[in-house]
């Protein structure tokens, strides 16, 4: 409970706060746990303690380890642990998972991305922002105080955002970067009772004996990605897979399509080499989600070949 994971990159500033809190008047002693060696408080040291804060200016890979902080008051002592890991800088753009701060979600109404841990540092504007390693440009992006605001958020805005700023300590400047994922939630998403767009109820589909025929069952379920929604065909009240006629197969599209902003699904029923007995079957297009089920029935009728005789 009183242990905190902290991480940073070599040659950047890293400031860690003791996981145990106390009044500003309480003294805090820091130790390197492996050696029990006290961390100095003199600012001339690259790694030094400053009350509740442990400062690495700048950090080195060798600084990795567990640090103990003891908050001392006249009546009690509280011990906390900071598990610090310093990583080498990546040569490529990819930010590994272990360097990522918590994911934040945004929507059209709320699209603030806060720069992680920035409150621990002595920084001044401007705060620089990058998405997937590219500097953000354009009027939709506004760096405001310690957070980024994105106007008119779209699903394409999802990705990894890195903030970069300068920490100042006694006139010396140190760079700091922090990255977190941003996901976009569709606040307007909703689901509704399925609406079948095709086929029409009790539709008669004309087919030619001996030819192939396709029937499409298409239904819409709401706005935004629809979970637990399905369209399927039944033959005489039986699922296609159980009907046992290899000439008749159903094929579903891979993704949800969007019609007028609604999420729709379709399932194509393919009948190869149409036979007379196929005309006797009842074909049901089913659309269902957690709101309920809608069923449209189709029957096949023979299409008379055009008489070409004069």
């Amino acid at each position: 409970k009183f242990s905190k994971q902290s991480w940073g990159l070599e040659n950047e500033a890293l400031i860690v706060r003791c996981p145990r809190q106390g009044k500003p008047s309480y003294t805090v002693d820091w130790y390197y746990s492996q050696t029990n060696k006290s961390i100095p408080t003199q600012e001339r040291n690259r790694v030094f303690a400053s009350g509740q804060l442990l400062k690495f200016l700048p950090a080195a890979v060798a600084d990795s380890g567990i640090y103990t902080c003891i908050v001392r008051s006249p009546t009690f002592n509280r011990t906390g642990y900071a598990n610090v890991t310093i990583y080498k800088k990546q040569s490529d753009c990819n930010v590994p998972d272990y360097l990522m701060y918590s994911t934040v979600s945004g929507s059209e109404k709320n699209s603030k991305i806060y720069c992680p841990t920035i409150d621990l540092y002595n920084w001044t504007a401007p705060l620089e922002w990058f998405k997937n390693c590219q500097a953000l440009q354009g009027s939709r992006y506004r760096a405001h105080k310690s957070f980024l605001v994105i106007d008119n958020v779209m699903t394409e805005d999802a990705g990894d955002y890195t903030c970069k700023f300068i920490h100042n300590e006694n006139g010396a400047n140190y760079s700091v970067t922090a990255t977190r994922s941003f996901t976009v939630k569709d606040e307007q998403g909703f689901s509704l009772f399925p609406v079948i767009g095709a086929p029409a109820q009790n539709e008669i589909k004309e087919v030619e004996i001996g030819k192939n025929a396709n029937l499409t069952c298409s239904a819409c379920f709401g706005k935004g990605t629809q979970f637990l929604a399905a369209v399927l065909w039944q033959l005489n009240g039986t699922k296609i897979t159980d009907f046992g006629e290899p000439r008749i197969q159903q094929e579903e599209g891979q993704n949800q399509s969007f019609s007028n902003g609604l999420a729709c699904l379709d399932m194509v029923l393919r009948i190869a080499d149409v036979k007379e007995e196929d005309l006797l079957l009842q074909y049901d297009c089913l659309a269902l989600n957690l709101h309920g089920l809608r069923r449209h029935t189709v029957r096949l009728s023979r299409k008379n070949p055009i008489d070409h005789h004069s």
Epitope: A230, N255, L286
Partner: nanobody
Framework: EVQLVESGGGLVQPGGSLRLSCAAS????????MGWFRQAPGKEREEVAA????????YYADSVKGRFTISADNSKNTAYLQMNSLKPEDTAVYYC?????????????WGQGTLVTVSS
């Protein structure tokens, strides 16, 4: 009567992987789709991933895209959720759900849940 039983949850370090299973016992021929949902302490239940029972369509929440994979084995009446590159914010109770129908009636069935904890 159909029952859903989840398994595969547990404690894993950030960056690690887990595979959840959801086995449906009983009559499952009316299954239309299955999905995974999750609920973190103090938060609302949220969708994670879903799959049509024929296996052709999959859906993922933005927060898990590229990391989680849902699949189904119809012969075993089981749905799976392969979770890679796990993050602390993936910590939650994961529930399996089944959408099915009988005649013109739709019913959804939920499992008891399996706890996934991502922590170092």
């Amino acid at each position: 009567e159909v029952q859903l039983v989840e398994s595969g949850g547990g404690l894993v370090q950030p960056g690690g992987s887990l595979r959840l299973s959801c086995a449906a016992s009983g009559r499952t021929d009316s299954t239309a789709s299955m999905g995974w949902f999750r609920q973190a302490p103090g938060k609302e239940r949220e969708e994670v991933a879903a799959i049509s029972w024929s296996g052709g369509r999959t859906y993922y929440a933005d927060s898990v895209k590229g990391r989680f994979t849902i699949s189904a084995d119809n012969s075993k009446n089981t749905a799976y959720l392969q979770m890679n590159s796990l993050k602390p914010e993936d910590t939650a109770v994961y529930y399996c759900a089944r959408l099915a129908f009988q005649g013109n009636t739709v019913f959804d069935l939920w499992g008891q849940g399996t706890l996934v904890t991502v922590s170092s």
